[in-house]
Interface confidence: low
């Protein structure tokens, strides 16, 4: 069973009395609808709050909705709806906060059938005040930001136009009409696809790729026959619509689409998509749907241009484009992935990478665990995550999985052990060392959220009954204390902490319901005084990253280089702080050939680490090798992997080959195969 | 001080099935794997397969896939190796090994191995008509 | 499954000199390897793990090296309590599998 309140847990002294002094209820003067909380800004404490109730009449459906500010992390709001002239906000665009700490805020309000276009309100200082705008159009999507300059907005309308702002909202121009995506791209670029004829969905696959860099004064065409496009990292990803069937390709671009080559992936055919799973600028993983309604496909790492794909896991659970898959980016700890596999018997895997999808493995089984009464095969036994496909499934999980990039190490998710997924009520498990170790952290399923950068653990039982009582650790999870905030019960909705686990604070939210009326609630809670002091240099000890065991001289070494980090010691009970930052020391490792993969025309062999020229070449390598750019082909075989930084050791030079003189094929005339696309 | 001891010589008629003990003390039952090996007269030494203490998972080599079980008893700290069907070829010492790393490992485990640093004192096992 | 090759088979050196004995993996095991010294009679015990560390209590005049496919147990200065039969043993893949020994032998 899980750790809990035995006698060899470090008990914080007189927690109760401390946090008594720092629970903070508010109660909202509103009937229960719907409710949606934002931070504005970065360690501002300042939260803004929207609660909206649909009234259905006959006729029409009456709307109200209340807004409400807090500027101390949520432990006093101030009922603020006459900023906005009680007007309706419409919660399917949400609240369109600004990037950074600019302090922009957009409302998209509910207007009557009958207006010439939509309203916003605006705030640019933390929503201390709104000014109300009048749009020239009805809009379709919320109001998106350009990252480099928070004053250029853009936005869809129901009529296909795309709108562009140049002073945050106060004037829109319309650049462009039949359009159907589009998207910020580097340096205030528009990328966006149009359609000629009759619809976005008509003209699927007959598209064309729009850029403008300079808000719609000029524009250039980057791209025809588009099915769609997405962005990632440094890469522009299209998939291109083939010339003589219903196919579609991927293309990439790294220079903003001056220039395009094809990837070297399966083509896909019209029930099929393409995901981008995760992107950097070092590299992308990309998600191949399989023909026919499988439900899963396969995963590929890309080389650093995202032009040569290794074939990373296969059976990759991915329902439908747009659907559920669990892939899951461990930011705690570089190069780790999780993600689940439907085996062949249709049961439900999950796998792990903890080298960026080189190798995948599956979760070692927490130390003192026993396989579950699921496992059909007791002897082959490992910890399987839930994540949004299970949550999809309407399993009782209520969360996904949880890791923060300043709590080092730390990964806290829903599971269960067996040889599968299980569809019993799940445990929380939770691993300190980025996902190669985990232990049961509480019996059942949770709400859970790191606060203080891992210096404390905050979780809620998830119940159907009312509840109010929280559970609290110091020692990642290792000990639980429970403190009861209420004396009267809520049924609980959320559990709410500044993004970016660096607060302190901890909002719990939910509804009190009466014979007449119910209402919203929320407790707020300080752990600063649980945490008294600040931490110091003795609070903190070496960890080496990824290490099995320290003796060896590889140890540790993860894409070229490894990485100690100063982390809190378990057993220290003090304050990272809101300023606390990760202390790491990378170390350059030798080159192995691990550290590099096969390129194009080459692989590896199962259980050998050299690249072997493939003795021909077949499918979408070889209309890689017909179609793809010339550069492409001529290559000694080894490309080193993206991001990795690696030095000396081994440096697998040999002969360049040119490929060219194996694009050749019985299926194409001797004119196609002449002609190569650049 | 960390030790692993067997059970007695055994003497087996083809066929016949033969289960051999190995009982582990001085050390967390738990935290370590426990591999079987065996060793013919005047041959080398062959790997027969490891077993997880923590809920028995194990892993076989192939040549005796479908004739060996390995199991174990956490109460009392002990892990046994049962082997069917015996031929005249398996007669063998048998020994068990403490093995801290485990094909069963997650992550890059196989990057580093620490080697089977504790054996048995090995059981004799004669398979004789 | 990988295979383990030793050579020589047998070894003959006399009181004090040096012995070099070789393993060869059929394909890389990393550094996923261990030497294990036999004597007439006992189990075997572990001498070098991770191709190259020493095992507690192993005396300094045994070194092992190698990585990938190429391992090398070194004997700096032969002990009459030396000789005996040696194993690799690899941890790369499953099954783990070791070779077929080289046994050291007073010349």
């Known amino acids: 069973s899980a750790p809990g309140e035995d006698e060899e847990c470090g008990r914080v002294r007189d927690f109760v009395a401390k946090l008594a002094n720092n629970t903070h209820q508010h109660v909202f003067d509103d009937l229960r609808g719907s409710v949606s909380l934002s931070w504005v800004g970065d360690s501002t404490g300042v939260i803004l709050v929207l609660t909206t109730f649909h009234v259905p009449l006959v006729i029409m459906t009456f709307g109200q909705s209340k807004l409400y500010r807090s500027e101390d992390y949520g432990k006093n709001f101030k009922d603020i709806t006459d900023l906005i002239n009680n007007t309706f906000i419409r919660t399917e665009f949400g609240m369109a906060i600004g990037p950074e700490n600019s302090g922009k805020v957009v409302l998209t309000a509910e207007v009557s059938g009958g207006s010439r276009g939509g309203r916003i309100f605006r705030s640019s200082d933390f929503a201390k005040n709104f000014v109300q705008t009048d749009l020239p159009f009805h809009p379709l999507t919320q109001m998106m930001y350009s990252p480099q300059n928070s004053d250029y907005l853009l936005a869809l309308s129901t009529e296909n136009g795309l709108w562009v702002s140049k002073n945050f909202g106060g004037k829109w121009e319309e650049i462009h009409k039949a359009v159907c995506l589009a998207k910020w791209g580097s340096d205030n670029t528009i990328f966006f696809t149009t359609y000629a004829n009759g619809s976005c969905k008509a003209d699927l696959g007959a598209l064309e790729l729009w850029r403008t860099s300079d808000l719609g004064k000029s524009f250039k065409t980057i791209g025809v026959k588009i099915y769609s496009f997405g962005l990632g990292g440094r890469f522009l990803f299209a998939s291109v619509m083939a010339d003589k069937d219903t196919t579609r390709r991927i293309h990439v671009s790294t220079d903003q689409g001056d220039t395009w080559s094809m990837a070297q992936l399966p083509s896909v055919g019209q029930e099929q998509f393409y995901s981008i799973l995760a992107a950097n600028d070092d590299m992308v993983f990309m998600h191949v749907d399989e023909p026919g309604d499988t439900g899963f496909g396969t995963i590929f790492t890309s080389d650093d241009r995202g032009i040569v794909y290794s074939k990373s896991l296969d059976r990759h659970l991915y329902t439908t484009t747009g659907g559920e898959t669990d892939f899951t980016n461990v930011t705690s700890l570089r190069g780790v992935y999780i993600t689940s596999v439907l085996s062949e018997d249709n049961s439900i895997q999950t796998m792990i990478t903890f080298d960026q999808g080189g190798r995948w493995t599956h979760l070692r089984k927490p130390e003192n665990s026993e396989c579950d009464a699921t496992a059909k095969n007791k002897n082959e036994c490992s910890l399987h995550i839930h994540a949004s496909y299970s949550i999809s499934q309407k399993l009782n999980v209520p969360m996904a999985p949880l890791s923060e990039p300043n709590a080092v190490g730390i990964v806290i998710a829903h599971g269960s052990v067996g040889d599968a997924i299980s569809v019993m009520v799940p445990d929380v498990y939770i691993s300190d060392d980025g996902g190669y170790s985990w232990t049961k952290m509480l019996e059942g399923p949770h709400y859970y959220t790191i606060l203080d950068s891992g210096g404390i653990i905050v979780a809620i039982e998830h119940s159907s009954r009312p509840i109010n009582v929280i559970k609290f650790s110091t020692d990642e999870g290792q000990c639980w204390q429970t403190y009861t905030f209420t004396r009267d019960p809520i049924y609980f909705t959320g559990l709410a902490s500044e993004p970016g686990a660096r607060s302190m604070n901890i909002s719990i939210w939910g509804f009190t319901e009466s014979f007449l009326t119910s209402q919203w609630v929320s407790y707020t809670i300080d752990f600063k005084d649980i945490l008294e002091r600040n931490c110091e240099e003795k609070d903190y000890t070496i960890w080496l990253a990824h290490s099995t065991d320290p003796e060896d001289y590889e140890d540790g070494c993860i894409l070229g280089y490894k990485e100690q980090f100063l982390r809190l010691a378990k057993s220290s009970v003090c304050q990272n702080g809101r300023d606390y930052v990760v202390t790491k020391q990378p170390s350059i490792c030798l080159c192995s050939l691990e550290d590099f993969l096969c390129d194009f025309g080459y692989y590896r062999p199962e259980n050998d680490s050299k690249c072997v020229e493939q003795p021909e070449l077949k499918g979408h390598d070889l209309e890689f090798c017909l179609y793809g750019r010339e550069e492409h082909l001529t290559t000694n075989g080894y490309r080193k992997i993206p991001g990795d930084k690696c030095q000396g050791g081994v440096n697998p030079v040999r002969e360049v080959k040119d490929l060219k003189k194996k694009c050749t094929s019985n299926f194409l005339s001797p004119e196609k195969q002449n002609s190569k696309s650049n | 001080q960390v030790q692993l001891v067997q059970s007695g010589a055994e003497v087996k008629k083809p066929g016949a099935s033969v289960k051999v003990s190995c009982k582990a003390s001085g050390y967390t039952f738990t935290s370590r794997y426990m591999s079987w090996v065996r060793q013919a007269p005047g041959q080398g030494l062959e790997w027969m397969g490891i077993i997880n203490p923590v809920g028995g998972s194990t892993s076989y080599a192939q040549k005796f896939q479908g004739r060996v079980t390995m199991t174990r008893d956490t109460s009392t700290s002990t892990v046994y190796m049962e082997l069917s069907s015996l031929r005249s070829e398996d007669t063998a010492v048998y020994y068990c090994?403490?093995?801290?790393?485990?094909?069963?490992?997650?992550?890059?485990?196989?990057?580093?191995?620490?080697?089977?640093?504790?054996w048995g004192q090995g059981t004799t096992v004669t398979v004789s008509s | 499954e990988i295979v383990m090759t030793q050579s020589p088979a047998t070894l003959s050196v006399s009181p004090g000199e040096r012995a070099t004995l070789s393993c060869r993996a059929s394909q890389s095991v990393s550094s996923n390897l261990a030497w294990y010294q036999q004597k007439p009679g006992q189990a075997p015990r572990l001498l070098i793990y991770g191709a190259s560390t020493r095992a507690t209590g192993i005396p300094a005049r045994f070194s092992g090296s190698g990585s990938g496919t190429e391992f090398t147990l070194t004997i700096s200065s032969l002990q009459s309590e030396d000789f005996a039969v040696y194993y690799c043993?690899?941890?790369?893949?499953?099954?783990?599998?070791f070779g077929g020994g080289t046994k050291v032998e007073i010349k």
């Open positions: 090994a403490r093995d801290p790393s485990g094909i069963a490992a997650a992550g890059p485990a196989s990057r580093y191995y620490y080697g089977m640093d504790v």
């Open positions: 043993q690899q941890a790369r893949l499953g099954p783990w599998t």
